[in-house]
Interface confidence: low
C-alpha cells in the first residue's frame, strides 16, 4: 500500500552504519526490489550493493563464528595434551636425574664409563614417546647388548677380550641372562606403558589438528546465500526487529555444515578409545609406574650382572673359550656392593588421576561437537527468536516456520528447503580428516591391546597424511637420540596441530 | 632472534676466580640446555661445560674439572661460569652456547647458537 | 681430539666436502669462524640439522663414525675456518676438532 512505500530506512542505515559501510549506498525510503538477488523481491531499504555486502558479512560472520567455536575445543584438547606431555615427561626426566644422581655412587665407573650409554636409551625412549618410528623392543635388545659388552669388559680388565670373542658373547647372553629378569620385564612393562602413554598424547594431537583444519574449509557460496536470507533479509525487508527461527536457523546451518556433521561417527570412535586407553595408565604395568621407574630397572639389572660375574664367566668361557690373559691389565676388579634400589612402586602422586578424571570429562562434553554445531552456533551467534513461532522471521516474512528439522550429515539434506546441498560431491578435506581419525582410533585400538600398530605386519590402511605442524615448546627442545638413524623418522601425526617451536628447524 | 650476551671478562690475577655471565634473549631460556666453550689465543674451541635446562646437572671438561661451576637463572635467563684458581693456561675468549635441546645429554654438536664471546686473559 | 683435514679449497660453485673422524658418539656439529677469536656460527647441529639462517648449501651426514659437512656450490663468503664438535666416551668429554681452513679461489 501507498503508506509503506514511504516508510523510512532509518534502522537499515544504522545497522549498515554499523557494519563499517558507507551510509550513502542506503535509500532514504523503500525502494521497488526487483534488482534483489537473495532476498524476497517486495519493497525494501536494500540496493544491490548493500545486498552484496551484507552477503559477504554474513558469510564471514558465520566462518568467524565456526572458527571461535573449533578455537575453544583446540584450546581444550592443546591443555590437555600440553598436561599429558609434561606429565609424561616429567616421569621419565625423573627417572634418568635419579639413575644420574644415584648410579655414580651406586655402581661407580661401572656406571660412569658407560654414562653415555644410559643417555641414548633415555634419548631413545623420549624418541619413542615422541611418535618416531623406532621399534622399542629391538631398542631395549641393542642397549642391554651394548651394555654386557662394555660390562664384561669392565668387570675383566685382566682379559684381552677382542670384537670375536664379544659376538660369541653376544651369542650366549640370550640364554645366560646375565641381567637377570630385568630386561625382559623392562621390555613388556615399557613397550605397553610407552604405547599407551604416546598413543593417547597422539590422539589429543590429531584431534586438535582436524579441528584445525575443518575449520579452514570454506563455506560455499549455496550457504552463503541461505546465511544472508537468515540473517540480514529480515533487515531489508523492513522487519528488522523480527530474529531468526529456531528451525530456519537450525536448516540452514545444517546445510552449510553438512560435511563437517559426517565427522561424528569417527570423532566418537576416537574420543570413546582415548578415554578407553586411560585405562592402561595404572597398574604395575602402567604409565605412571613404568615410566617413572625405568632406573630401578636398570639398577637391578646391573646387580643381577653384578652377582652372577663368576657363573656367567665360567659358562662364557665354556662357551667361548679361554681368552688371553692381558699382560697390562690389572686383576679382576672386586665385587663391588650392590647398588642400593629405590622402591619400584612410585606411589601414585595423584597428579595422573586427576588429569585424567578432568579429561575423561572434557572429551564427554565434545563428543557431539559437530552435530551440534548447528544448535550451539544458532542458539550462541545468532540471535534466535523467543517469540512465539508466527512471530518469527521465516526467511519470507514474519511468520511460522513449517519445514521440518532436517537430519544431521550430507546425506540428510538432500531435501534440505533452505540450502542447496549436493550430497553426491563430500568435501575432500573432511573426508580425509575422517580418514585421519579412523587411523588415529586403529592405532589407539592397538594400543589398549598393548601392541605398536606401526610395527604389526598387518598394519592399517596407511599412515596418517596429514600435517603434523612442528611440536610442543618443550617438546622440540627434548633431544631426540644421540644416533642418527635415516629410518627414525617422526610419524606423521607424532604431536600435530601446534605451533612450530620458535623458529627451529630440522632439515 | 636468539641472542646471548657474555659478559665479565678482561684481566684476572693467577689464583684469583673469574665469574662470566652470559644473558640469553629470543627463546623460551628454561627449556634448553646451556654450555660454554673457551678458544685460547691462535688455538681451537675447547668444551668447559654444560648445564642442563632445569640447572639440575651439570658436566665439566677435564682441565677446568674441579675449578668450574655452572649455574643458571630461569628467572632471568641468565647462565654464570665460575672458575676459581685462575691460571695462565685460562686466557681465552670463552663463548655461551645453546644446545637445540632440553634434557641432559646434550653436547658440543647440540649447539646451535652462540654469543659472540667474552676475553678473559689471566696474567700478574 | 678429533681429526679433520687442516685445509680445504675449492673454486666458486664447486661443492666441497670436510670430513670429520674419530668421535665415538656418532654425533657431529659444525661451526663457522671468519677469524680467530671473532664469532661462532653454526651451519650443522646433530649431523644433519640446520638453523633457520644458514644457507641451505650446508649440509651435514654421518656415515659410521664420521662426519661430513657438505657445501654445495660454495661461495667466496663461505672462506673461513670450520670447526667439528663430537663425543670421545674413552674420556667421557666433549671434543672439537682443529679446524679446517677453507679457501674459495
Known amino acids: 500500500d501507498p503508506a509503506s512505500k514511504s516508510r523510512s530506512c532509518g534502522e537499515v542505515r544504522q545497522i549498515y552504519g554499523a557494519k563499517g559501510f558507507s551510509l550513502s549506498d542506503v535509500p532514504q525510503a523503500e525502494i521497488s526490489g526487483e534488482h534483489l538477488r537473495i532476498c524476497p523481491q517486495g519493497y525494501t531499504c536494500c540496493t544491490s550493493e548493500m545486498e552484496e555486502n551484507l552477503a559477504n558479512r554474513s558469510h564471514a560472520e558465520l566462518e568467524t563464528a565456526l572458527r571461535d567455536s573449533s578455537r575453544v575445543l583446540q584450546a581444550m584438547l592443546a591443555t590437555q595434551l600440553r598436561s599429558f606431555d609434561d606429565h609424561f615427561q616429567h616421569l621419565l626426566n625423573d627417572s634418568e636425574r635419579t639413575l644420574q644422581a644415584t648410579f655414580p655412587g651406586a655402581f661407580g665407573e661401572l656406571y660412569t664409563q658407560n654414562a653415555r650409554a644410559f643417555r641414548d636409551l633415555y634419548s631413545e625412549l623420549r624418541l619413542y614417546y615422541r611418535g618416531a618410528n623406532l621399534h622399542l623392543e629391538e631398542t631395549l635388545a641393542e642397549f642391554w647388548a651394548r651394555l654386557l659388552e662394555r660390562l664384561f669388559k669392565q668387570l675383566h680388565p685382566q682379559l684381552l677380550l677382542p670384537d670375536d670373542y664379544l659376538d660369541c658373547l653376544g651369542k650366549q647372553a640370550e640364554a645366560l641372562r646375565p641381567f637377570g629378569e630385568a630386561p625382559r620385564e623392562l621390555r613388556l612393562r615399557a613397550t605397553r606403558a610407552f604405547v599407551a602413554a604416546r598413543s593417547f598424547v597422539q590422539g589429543l594431537g590429531v584431534a586438535s589438528d582436524v579441528v584445525r583444519k575443518v575449520a579452514q574449509v570454506p563455506l560455499g557460496p549455496e550457504c552463503s546465500r541461505a546465511v544472508m536470507k537468515l540473517v540480514y533479509c529480515a533487515h531489508c525487508l523492513g522487519v528488522p526487529g523480527a530474529r531468526p527461527c529456531p528451525d530456519y536457523c537450525r536448516n540452514v546451518l545444517k546445510g552449510c555444515l553438512a560435511n563437517q556433521a559426517d565427522l561424528d561417527a569417527e570423532w566418537r570412535n576416537l574420543l570413546d578409545s582415548m578415554v578407553l586407553i586411560t585405562d592402561k595408565f595404572w597398574g604395575t604395568s602402567g604409565v605412571e609406574s613404568v615410566i617413572g621407574s625405568v632406573h630401578t630397572w636398570l639398577a637391578e639389572a646391573i646387580n643381577a650382572l653384578q652377582d652372577n660375574r663368576d657363573t656367567l664367566t665360567a659358562k662364557v668361557i665354556q662357551g667361548c673359550g679361554n681368552p688371553k690373559v692381558n699382560p697390562q691389565g690389572p686383576g679382576p676388579e672386586e665385587k663391588r656392593r650392590r647398588g642400593k634400589l629405590a622402591p619400584r612402586e612410585r606411589p601414585p602422586s595423584g597428579t595422573l588421576e586427576k588429569l585424567v578424571s578432568e579429561a575423561k570429562a572434557q572429551l564427554r562434553d565434545v563428543q557431539d561437537f559437530w552435530i551440534s554445531l548447528p544448535g550451539t552456533l544458532c542458539s550462541e551467534k545468532m540471535a534466535l527468536s523467543t517469540a512465539s513461532d508466527d512471530r518469527c522471521w521465516n526467511g519470507m516474512a514474519r511468520g511460522r516456520y513449517l519445514p521440518e528439522v532436517m537430519g544431521d550429515g550430507l546425506a540428510n539434506q538432500i531435501n534440505n528447503p533452505e540450502v542447496e546441498v549436493d550430497i553426491t560431491k563430500p568435501d575432500m578435506t573432511i573426508r580425509q580428516q575422517i580418514m585421519q581419525l579412523k587411523i588415529m582410533t586403529n592405532r589407539l585400538r592397538s594400543a589398549y591391546n598393548g601392541n605398536d600398530v606401526d610395527f604389526q605386519d598387518a598394519s592399517d590402511d596407511g599412515s596418517g597424511s596429514g600435517s603434523g605442524d612442528g611440536c610442543l615448546d618443550d617438546l622440540c627442545s627434548r633431544k631426540v637420540s644421540r644416533k642418527s638413524s635415516s629410518s627414525r623418522t617422526p610419524l606423521t601425526h607424532a604431536l600435530p596441530g601446534l605451533s612450530e617451536q620458535e623458529g627451529q628447524k630440522t632439515s | 632472534a636468539v641472542t646471548l650476551d657474555e659478559s665479565g671478562g678482561g684481566l684476572q690475577t693467577p689464583g684469583r676466580a673469574l665469574s662470566l655471565v652470559c644473558k640469553a634473549s629470543g627463546f623460551t631460556f628454561s627449556n634448553y640446555d646451556m654450555l660454554w666453550v673457551r678458544q685460547a689465543p691462535g688455538k681451537g674451541l675447547e668444551w668447559v661445560g654444560v648445564i642442563s635446562s632445569s640447572g639440575s646437572s651439570t658436566n665439566y671438561g677435564a682441565a677446568v674439572k674441579g675449578r668450574a661451576t655452572i649455574s643458571r637463572d630461569n628467572g632471568q635467563n641468565t647462565v654464570r661460569l665460575q672458575l676459581n684458581n685462575l691460571r695462565a693456561e685460562d686466557t681465552a675468549t670463552y663463548y655461551c652456547?645453546?644446545?637445540?635441546?632440553?634434557?641432559?645429554?646434550?653436547?658440543?654438536?647440540?649447539?646451535?647458537?652462540w654469543g659472540l664471546g667474552t676475553e678473559v686473559i689471566v696474567s700478574t | 681430539a678429533l681429526t679433520q683435514p687442516s685445509s680445504v679449497s675449492a673454486n666458486p660453485g664447486e661443492t666441497v666436502k670436510i670430513t670429520c673422524s674419530g668421535g665415538s658418539g656418532n654425533n657431529y656439529g659444525w661451526y663457522q669462524q671468519k677469524s680467530p677469536g671473532s664469532a661462532l656460527v653454526t651451519v650443522i647441529y646433530d649431523n644433519n640439522k640446520r638453523p633457520t639462517d644458514i644457507p641451505s648449501r650446508f649440509s651435514g651426514s654421518t656415515s659410521g663414525s664420521t662426519g661430513t659437512l657438505t657445501i654445495t656450490g660454495v661461495q667466496a663468503e663461505d672462506e673461513a675456518v670450520y670447526f667439528c664438535g663430537g663425543y670421545d666416551s674413552s674420556t667421557y668429554a666433549d671434543i672439537f676438532g682443529a679446524g679446517t681452513t677453507l679457501t674459495v679461489l
Open positions: 652456547a645453546k644446545s637445540a635441546y632440553g634434557y641432559y645429554g646434550s653436547g658440543v654438536s647440540d649447539i646451535d647458537a
